[in-house]
Interface confidence: low
């Protein structure tokens, strides 16, 4: 392979925003590979040398007067005119989530389990996701992936509940995220939809089969004790 | 207190490769970067040029500087060349997998450097290029770089797809390997038996009492031909 | 003190070669890029040629490529521009000037007279 | 290329008056990149104002740089008798980098 050295610049210049523009931090970053050798902190006001290597940089241009000048308006001229062009795409971007709930394993009912809450495909990224058990949040045995960023503007996280599933049981997945009015639920029933059918289908077979042989022996046993002894009584006029 | 929002605007020269990067961030999305061989602003997302411009011709002269600046600290540091720092790399959907129903398969990169990579997605070992996508060199906060790639697929049980990265730092190009777990269903034991029990007693059940009622009824008709003594 | 001289202008036929220097003091050459401007007699200024520090990166004004070339010397603090091929149009005051590109010109030497006429 | 036009070509003005000279970019021009120059007969060219608006070293007050995408201005706000030269205004934002026809302060 190429195995010729290899030498990188790297120049992140920064605008930090908090409570929207209200206070701005604005900082000019240089690097040689991963090490940073000079910035402007628009708290500090001028340049100052990070490693050694930044001082030549540092000294000359903090004896450029009208450059420091230019730096220390930045955090109106860059960063909060930039804010604003993009605000409407970026800070207002709103996609709401879609959530599936999941076993992790395939296990029967009574054994240990992870119920998999998939939250995906929205932005911004601050979401908050909660299980509940018939009602009651869980919050023992919830693990996360943690905030997954797809890189095309979405987040999607998975938040696992560890629990023993019990016939009959309501779990709840509650998603709140700031593109919804109210919050998200999703229910999952401690049994799936094939066991409930095959134990409806079996109780309906066996009362269905019982009605039937009940029915069945109550004419027999009826109409065998009408007709015993063969001694039948005429009609009383 | 911690900021609500970050908007960082990321350059990059690497030599001798002559590769530059231009690309402005938001809360660690990219927004834009500027195709250096094409002179032109590549928005992330397509509407992002509806609501803004971006003049990319002023990103080539940043570039020229950070090659300048580049030339300056490479004599200044001894010509001290960079330590290759190997990917972690992680292998995911868009969103849960469901037999036949289109997916996104995303290959991440992350925590490298230098800013150069080579991927590639393998389809059952065989290389894939139709519909695949990636972003540029993303920046981190500890200034190593992150990447995407992207391979829209149909899930299958009888598709594995890898994604291969080969990286400086690498000895060996690295395989991340995915495949479609089909969930076997639950045993369902008592539910099994309940059912088989209660149908097969149901059904015993129907043609017995059948039986008797047929049996029952027709004694009654017997009877009642017969008539009175 | 801090200066850019300019040399080796003249009187040169077209289709001629002439090698102009720049000789800097009073800075460290080597940490500045530099650049090459010129101006026709009467004209305004133009730019032709730019290079990086260490010599590694070259620029050049359309009207000058691939007749042109610009280069340095910093063990001797010194820009050159070779010019080939020069045409009629290329007579002008030639000024070396220190910064490009983050910086604009913020040093100018005081030019170099370069006349083609036959 | 950027195509750069100084309006007026020339301006008549006496001392003590305020100057206003134009600069207007073909296309956007970066205004962190955008330089202004004056010019005596005979001297070289001096840098007054880079970035549009800082001043260079030792560029009086009076000077001052003004503008952003296509719209450019220098303006001297009292104009003095060394003030009467060629101003020329530059972009280096994108290559080649390009100046201006410049613009003729004269004295009336």
């Known amino acids: 392979g190429d195995t010729r050295p290899r030498f990188l610049e790297q120049v992140k210049h920064e605008c930090h925003f908090f409570n929207g523009t209200e206070r701005v931090r604005f900082l000019d970053r240089y690097f040689y590979h991963q090490e940073e050798y000079v910035r402007f902190d628009s708290d500090v006001g001028e340049y100052r040398a990070v490693t050694e290597l930044g001082r030549p940089d540092a000294e000359y241009w903090n004896s450029q007067k009208d450059l420091l000048e230019q730096k220390r308006a930045a955090v109106d001229t860059y960063c909060r005119h930039n804010y604003g062009v993009g605000e409407s795409f970026t800070v207002q971007r709103r996609v709401y989530p879609e959530v599936t709930v999941y076993p992790a394993k395939t296990q029967p009912l009574q054994h240990h389990n992870l119920l998999v809450c998939s939250v995906n495909g929205f932005y911004p990224g601050s979401i908050e996701v909660r299980w509940f058990r018939n009602g009651q949040e869980e919050k023992t045995g919830v693990v996360s992936t943690g905030l997954i960023q797809n890189g095309d503007w979405t987040f999607q996280t998975l938040v696992m509940l560890e629990t023993v599933p019990r016939s009959g049981e309501v779990y709840t997945c509650q998603v709140e995220h700031p593109s919804l009015t109210s919050p998200l639920t999703v229910e999952w029933r401690a049994r799936s939809e094939s066991a409930q059918s095959k134990m409806l289908s079996g109780v309906g077979g066996f009362v269905l089969g019982l009605l039937f042989l009940g029915a069945g022996l109550f004419i027999y046993f009826r109409n065998q004790k009408g007709h015993s002894g063969l001694q039948p009584t005429g009609f009383l006029s | 207190i911690k900021e609500e929002h970050v908007i960082i605007q990321a350059e990059f020269y690497l030599n001798p490769d002559q590769s530059g990067e231009f690309m402005f961030d938001f809360d660690g999305d990219e927004i834009f970067h500027v195709d250096m061989a094409k002179k032109e602003t590549v928005w992330r997302l397509e509407e992002f040029g509806r609501f803004a411009s971006f003049e990319a011709q002023g990103a080539l002269a940043n570039i020229a500087v950070d090659k300048a600046n580049l030339e300056i600290m490479t004599k200044r540091s001894n010509y001290t060349p960079i330590t290759n720092v190997p990917p972690e790399v992680t292998v995911l959907t868009n969103s849960p997998v469901e037999l036949r129903e289109p997916n996104v398969l995303i290959c991440f990169i992350d925590k490298f450097t230098p800013p150069v990579v080579n991927v590639t997605w393998l389809r059952n070992g065989k290389p894939v290029t139709t519909g695949v996508s990636e972003t540029v060199f993303l920046p981190r906060e500890d200034h190593l770089f992150r990447k995407f790639h992207y391979l829209p697929f149909l899930p299958s049980t009888e598709d594995v797809y890898d994604c291969r990265v080969e990286h400086w730092g690498l000895d060996e190009p690295l395989l991340k390997h995915w495949e479609f777990d089909a969930p076997s269903p639950l045993p369902e034991t008592t539910e099994n038996v309940v059912c088989a029990l209660g149908l097969t007693v149901g059904l015993v059940g129907i043609i017995i009492g059948t039986i008797f009622i047929i049996k029952g009824v027709r004694k009654s008709n017997a009877a009642e031909r017969r008539g009175p003594l | 003190e801090v200066q850019l001289v300019e040399s080796g202008g003249g009187l040169v036929q077209p289709g001629g070669s002439l090698r102009l220097s720049c000789a800097a003091s009073?800075?460290?050459?080597?940490?500045?890029?530099m650049s090459w401007v010129r101006q026709a007699p009467g004209k305004g200024l133009e730019w032709v040629s730019a290079?990086?520090?260490?010599?590694?990166?070259?620029y050049y004004a359309d009207s000058v490529k691939g007749r042109f070339t610009i280069s340095r010397d910093n063990s001797k603090n010194t820009l050159y521009l070779q010019m080939n091929s020069l045409r009629a149009e290329d007579t002008a005051v030639y000024y070396c000037?220190?910064?490009?590109?983050?910086?604009?010109?913020?040093?100018w030497g005081q030019g170099t007279l370069v006349t083609v006429s036959s | 290329d950027i195509v750069l036009t100084q309006s007026p070509a020339t301006l008549s003005l006496s001392p003590g008056e305020r100057a206003t000279l134009s600069c207007r970019a073909s296309q956007s021009v970066s205004s962190s990149y955008l330089a202004w120059y004056q010019q005596k007969p005979g001297q070289a060219p001096r840098l007054l104002i880079y970035?549009?608006?800082s001043r260079a070293t030792g560029v009086p007050a009076r000077f001052s740089g003004s503008g952003s995408g296509t719209d450019f201005t220098l303006t001297i706000s009292s104009l003095e008798p060394e003030d009467f030269a060629v101003y020329y205004c530059?972009?280096?934002?994108?290559?080649?980098?390009?100046f201006g026809q410049g613009t003729k302060v004269e004295i009336k």
């Open positions: 290079i990086s520090g260490s010599g590694g990166s070259t």
């Open positions: 970035g549009a608006s």
């Open positions: 530059q972009q280096y934002s994108n290559l080649p980098f390009t």
């Open positions: 000037a220190r910064g490009y590109g983050r910086y604009s010109p913020d040093l």
């Open positions: 009073g800075f460290t050459f080597s940490s500045y890029a």
